[in-house]
């Protein structure tokens, strides 16, 4: 289960992403946006600083279907 406000690395990061994203799948980096020239990947954002559920969800592969 996801525990907020902690760093997540390695297998724990993978397992947490699988839990959060479920069937949607996930990826470890996002395309660079126009706003920031360099897009940080999830390892930078979660392994070396606290990351929350909302941030983790941005790495899920496709949006959850709304019922």
């Amino acid at each position: 289960a996801y525990r907020p406000s902690e760093t997540l690395c390695g297998g724990e990061l993978v397992d947490t992403l699988q839990f959060v994203c479920g069937d949607r799948g996930f990826y470890f980096s996002r395309p660079a946006s126009r706003v920031s020239r360099r897009s940080r990947g999830i390892v930078e954002e979660c392994c070396f600083r606290s990351c929350d559920l909302a941030l983790l969800e941005t790495y899920c592969a496709t949006p959850a279907k709304s019922e």
Epitope: T7, L8, C9, G10, G11, E12, L13, V14, D15, F28, S29, G41, I42, V43, E44, C47, F48
Partner: antibody, heavy 127, light 107 residues
Framework: EVQLLESGGGLVQPGGSLRLSCAAS????????MIWVRQAPGKGLEWVSS???????KYADSVKGRFTISRDNSKNTLYLQMNSLRAEDTAVYYC?????????????????????WGQGTMVTVSS | DIQMTQSPSSLSASAGDRVTITCRAS??????LNWYQQKPGKAPNLLIY???NLQGGVPSRFSGSGSGTDFTLTISSLQPEDFATYYC?????????FGGGTKVEIK
């Protein structure tokens, strides 16, 4: 040939400093986590520190604040600066290659282990 | 921190024997468990990663299994070159931790 070669070990007095180096060859050094692991005489393996390709670091509690891991990707070299050395730091120090920076390869395959090791360098802390 | 406990700490066996070494984690580490072999005076060598994946060049007599907290390394038919010390290591979270080792000796 994929290879890691440590240097810089030796005898140092308690409270002293030492800098270990690990020269890498045969692979794209800048893409990988790199690791220091140590082994006290007659004892098991102990993880010391890890550094990601872009320089972020992790340390064992036993060395935090005393040891600093760093790397020079342009020289394919990993370093371990050891300060305030103690008798319990006496060990063979190994550098090892860890996983790719983001753990996954281009085909989406997860890997997190130490697959390439150096031959080790002995550090003795004694007065 | 995740503690890794190996058993037995040592064992005596003969060439041709089937050998099993166990590793237990203090909390679930899913499948993120690696095994290394170390011979005296040499660096460790990766045998198996992520529980059951054989590293390139490692003989097929080595195999790994388990999940969660309990893991096993099996050598199906011990060869003279297999007499060594074996370590498990968890790759689940920092700090990365190793088991205490299992020394496989000649009977």
């Amino acid at each position: 040939e994929v290879q890691l070669l440590e240097s810089g070990g030796g005898l140092v007095q308690p409270g002293g400093s030492l800098r270990l180096s690990c020269a890498a060859s045969g692979f794209t050094f800048s893409r990988y986590w790199m690791i220091w692991v140590r082994q006290a005489p007659g004892k098991g393996l102990e993880w010391v520190s890890s550094i990601r390709s872009s320089g972020e670091t992790k340390y064992a509690d036993s060395v935090k604040g005393r040891f600093t891991i760093s790397r020079d990707n342009s020289k394919n070299t990993l370093y371990l600066q050891m300060n305030s050395l103690r008798a319990e730091d006496t060990a063979v120090y190994y550098c090892a290659r860890g996983p790719l920076s983001d753990y996954y390869d281009s085909s989406g395959y997860y890997f997190d282990a130490f697959d390439i090791w150096g031959q080790g360098t002995m550090v003795t802390v004694s007065s | 921190d995740i503690q890794m406990t190996q058993s037995p700490s040592s064992l005596s066996a003969s060439a041709g024997d089937r050998v099993t070494i166990t590793c237990r984690a203090s909390q679930s580490i899913s499948s993120y468990l690696n095994w290394y072999q170390q011979k005296p005076g040499k660096a460790p060598n990766l045998l198996i990663y992520t529980t059951s994946n054989l590293q390139g060049g490692v003989p097929s007599r080595f195999s790994g299994s388990g999940s969660g907290t309990d893991f096993t390394l099996t050598i199906s038919s011990l060869q003279p070159e297999d007499f060594a010390t074996y370590y498990c290591q968890q790759g689940y979270s920092f700090p990365l931790t190793f088991g205490g080792g299992t020394k496989v000796e000649i009977k």
